[in-house]
């Protein structure tokens, strides 16, 4: 008779996580009778994946009735495959003994798991940043195989270039992971803007993944002040108003000083949104000029964010004739949008009226 | 190893049934035909059917097909044979044996189990 | 059915000689290129035991003196030194179609 030969076709098969994957194998001779055995692996640590004999191999069946007379049909169906049973599969012949006696394998069937990445996840800074800086966003994509993978990062729908990516492991492995950092420099407009991170793989059928982060997340838009001041009421009061500006996000502190001592603080809350996700928030201030004798400071200090307070003063000049009074205040905005205070006088006439 | 253990002796009467067991250990039950073969006192060996585990196919020896009944308790590894309608010349010793190679042959015995028919 | 018919029925044969048993199928037993042919020892007491397998293969554990020939429907048993240990009743038995064994033949020492 012909010598036994133990045949495995293919030398490798490709399945999709979830799947059955079949391993194909024929002898050409009954003799000599005894059993198969599926390894993955060679060597000394092999692991048994079926043995047609004895053992329970609940996930393993044979394709073949193994008590089909004359079977010469050692294929055998792995059930619901995952990325750990990748690696190399041998149908090995055994001469019936006590023990069994290996007798000749087959060439091996590589058995490679196309397993689906992961929903890609999108981290921004931990910190904000404000316009003009560059922030760094992370996309981590895990459990894929094999380790083709493609990443792209969008801004608003632009390709960025600036980003690095890397899949590890390096070697072979039954799974891996893709972790990749973009760049992005940020404008005042950005409130709005968001990245994506989009990962294509040949499980994926052309369809990628897609990960999302806000940039309303990553960015801080310092506020702009200004004052404005209205005439002189009747009742000797005059209405000045802080505006802050173009600010984001909403968290915001604001305090008026008189003369530097604490006169109110609001906390901005529920206010309207610009179309470009920033807020405005108008504060004002009536001021008692005939409870004055000399000219009131005024400082709209803003506190946004935690960051340092900005403060914008003005001085609002109080007449020394009483007969005048009613009319002769003047008020001047002599403040910057720089954090601390500045505080430039009026001209030395006091008798001068002043409106802005 | 492979080992097959039967049912004891038996001592039945004319007209009368016999169940003999065989249970099976050291392999897969499912994987392997169990043949029954019987032997008269001084005699030839005398197959009379076999079945396999995995989902009950039964051949049977022509001879025996309307008297002798093959079954398998799976979740046991355990083959019985039943023989009905005992005439004397069904005294024997009862044999199962497993068939290693699915070439209807028979590798492993059982000691078997002696069924002796008298009135 | 196919008929097996062994010779002799009995034999007698002295230690270290060769005995042959001969089996012959009413029928061809040949399929697929295999010889559906296997020979069995019974020692007094004992259960049989498979020593030859398709005609011609030697089961695990079995001493090489016992060898099988033969294909179609002509078939041997050959043992090549005869210990005492031989003593036995021998079979054949076929599996072309379903089992039959012949009827066996006694070897007993000269």
């Known amino acids: 008779e012909e010598e036994l030969q133990v045949i495995q076709p293919e030398k490798s098969v490709s399945v999709a996580a979830g799947e059955s994957a079949t391993l194909n194998c024929t002898a050409t001779s009954l003799i000599p009778v005894g059993p198969i055995q599926w390894f993955r692996g060679v060597g000394p640590g092999r692991e048994l994946i079926y043995h047609q004999k004895e053992g329970h191999f609940p996930r393993v069946t044979p394709v073949s009735d193994p008590t089909k007379r004359n079977n010469m049909d050692f294929s055998i169906r792995i059930s619901n495959i995952t990325p750990a049973d990748a690696g190399t599969y041998y149908c090995v012949k055994f001469r019936k003994g006590s023990p069994d006696v290996e007798l000749k394998s087959g060439a091996g069937t590589e058995l490679s798991v196309r397993a689906k990445p992961s929903a890609p996840v999108v981290s921004g800074p931990a910190v904000r940043a404000t316009a003009e800086h560059t922030v760094s966003f992370t996309c981590e994509s895990h459990g894929f195989s094999p380790r083709d993978i493609t990443l792209k990062w969008f801004k608003n729908g632009n390709e960025l270039s600036d980003f690095q990516t890397n899949v590890d492991p390096a070697g072979k492995s039954v799974s891996y992971s893709i972790r990749s950092t973009a760049r992005v420099v940020l404008t005042r407009r950005d409130v709005h803007s968001q990245v994506i991170c989009e990962v294509a793989h040949v499980t994926l059928q052309g369809d990628p993944l897609r990960g999302t982060a806000n940039l309303s997340e990553a960015i801080r838009v310092p506020p702009f002040l200004e004052f404005t001041q209205q005439s002189m009421r009747a009742d000797n009061q005059v209405n000045v108003t802080c505006q802050v500006m173009k600010f984001y996000p909403q968290r915001l502190q604001l305090t008026w000083l008189e003369n530097g001592n604490v006169s109110r603080t609001e906390m901005a809350s529920a206010l309207p949104e610009n179309k470009d996700g920033t807020y405005n928030w108008t504060s004002w201030l009536l001021v008692n000029v005939s409870a004055h004798r000399d000219d009131v400071k005024l400082t709209c200090q803003v506190e946004h964010d935690g960051q340092p307070a900005v403060n914008k003063s003005f001085s609002v000049k109080v007449s020394a004739h009483p007969k005048e009074q009613g009319s002769n205040t003047a008020a001047e905005n002599t403040g910057t949008n720089e954090r601390g205070s500045s505080d430039y006088k009026d001209d030395d006439d006091k008798h001068h009226h002043h409106h802005h | 190893q492979v080992q097959l253990v039967q049912s004891g002796a038996e001592v039945k009467k004319p007209g009368a049934s016999v169940k003999v067991s065989c249970k099976a250990s050291g392999y897969t039950f499912t994987n392997y035909w169990i043949n029954w073969v019987r032997q008269a006192p001084g005699q030839g060996l005398e197959w009379i059917a076999m079945i396999d585990p995995s989902d009950s196919e039964t051949h049977y020896n022509q001879i025996f097909k309307d008297r002798a009944t093959l079954t398998t308790d799976t979740s046991t590894s355990t083959a019985y044979m039943e023989l009905r309608s005992l005439r004397s010349d069904d005294t024997a010793v009862y044999y199962c044996?497993?068939?290693?190679?699915?070439?209807?042959?028979?590798?492993?015995w059982g000691r078997g189990t002696l069924v002796t028919v008298s009135s | 059915d196919i008929v097996l018919t062994q010779s002799p029925d009995s034999l007698a044969v002295s230690l270290g000689e060769r005995a042959t048993i001969n089996c012959r199928a009413s029928k061809s037993v040949s399929s697929s290129g295999y010889n559906y042919i296997f020979w069995y020892q019974q020692k007094p007491g004992q259960p049989p035991k498979l020593l030859i397998y398709?005609?011609?293969n030697l089961d695990s554990g079995v001493p090489d003196r016992f060898s099988g020939s033969g294909s179609g429907t002509d078939f041997t048993l050959t043992i090549s030194s005869l210990q005492a240990e031989d003593v036995a009743v021998y079979y054949c038995q076929e599996s072309r179609e379903l089992p039959t064994f012949g009827q066996g033949t006694k070897l007993e020492i000269k």
């Open positions: 398709l005609a011609s």
């Open positions: 044996a497993m068939d290693y190679g699915s070439l209807y042959a028979m590798d492993y």
